[in-house]
């Protein structure tokens, strides 16, 4: 899938964690088929 960023947004993060995607893990592998 593709995500495009850079569109204007007024949302704010409610946590102190970065909003970037975490490091990939094999658990995130898409199901075959």
């Amino acid at each position: 899938s593709e995500t495009t960023t850079g569109t204007s947004s007024n949302s704010s993060q409610s946590t102190s964690n970065s909003g970037l995607a975490p490091n990939p893990t094999n658990a995130t592998t898409k199901a075959a088929g």
Epitope: S1, Q13, S18, L20, A21, N23, P24, T25, N26, T29
Partner: antibody, heavy 118, light 107 residues
Framework: EVQLQQSGPELVKPGASVKISCKAS????????MNWVKQSPEKSLEWIGE????????TFNQKFKAKATLTVDRSSSTAYMHLKSLTSEDSAVYYC???????????WGQGTTLTVSS | DVQITQSPSYLAASPGETITIYCRAS??????LAWYQEKPEKTNRLLIY???TLQSGIPSRFRGSGSGKDFTLTVSGLEPEDFAMYYC?????????FGAGTKLELK
Amino acid sequence: EVQLQQSGPELVKPGASVKISCKASGYEFTGYHMNWVKQSPEKSLEWIGEINPITSDKTFNQKFKAKATLTVDRSSSTAYMHLKSLTSEDSAVYYCARRDYDTSLDYWGQGTTLTVSS
Amino acid sequence: DVQITQSPSYLAASPGETITIYCRASKSISKYLAWYQEKPEKTNRLLIYAGSTLQSGIPSRFRGSGSGKDFTLTVSGLEPEDFAMYYCQQHNEYPLTFGAGTKLELK
């Protein structure tokens, strides 16, 4: 030792396309997103986007969505960026960089110089 | 997008001196600012991440501070190899954005 080895300089004509490669070594290729960054005198550093090497999910900067295509070849631990419909404004140095969630862009390639000229 | 304003764009100093570079974000980025060093014929080097955490192998004369919108990079006791370009970059949200850079030159 983590290394990102990029392909060599490119001189292409306006309207053409180019594919830049970034071969990773010294770490588990699928464990980190691969990012791409453009450096030009006019705009300094601009983030193009990133790709998840496991799922091939991509996140793009809106500005580069129609310009860049990101792919990976897990068998060779290589990431690729294809740039199309090139103009003089695409002339720049392009970097691949590994992104770690905690540390951000912790390792960079040496850069690939792209010159678009007729 | 988060705009990053970096200053100064140019700085001249001598070995042994202490210098400070500033970056301001257009909105709060929590602690998520990184600093990089760029030198000719070398790959870009991550110095500091998450505002103040020193990357492994980076000398302790490099120090980052700040949170929210205002951040600083301080280099104490400048060494000859420290004269280079420095960039800040927010890693709080997409798209990642960079400051315009600071060129640190020998006075």
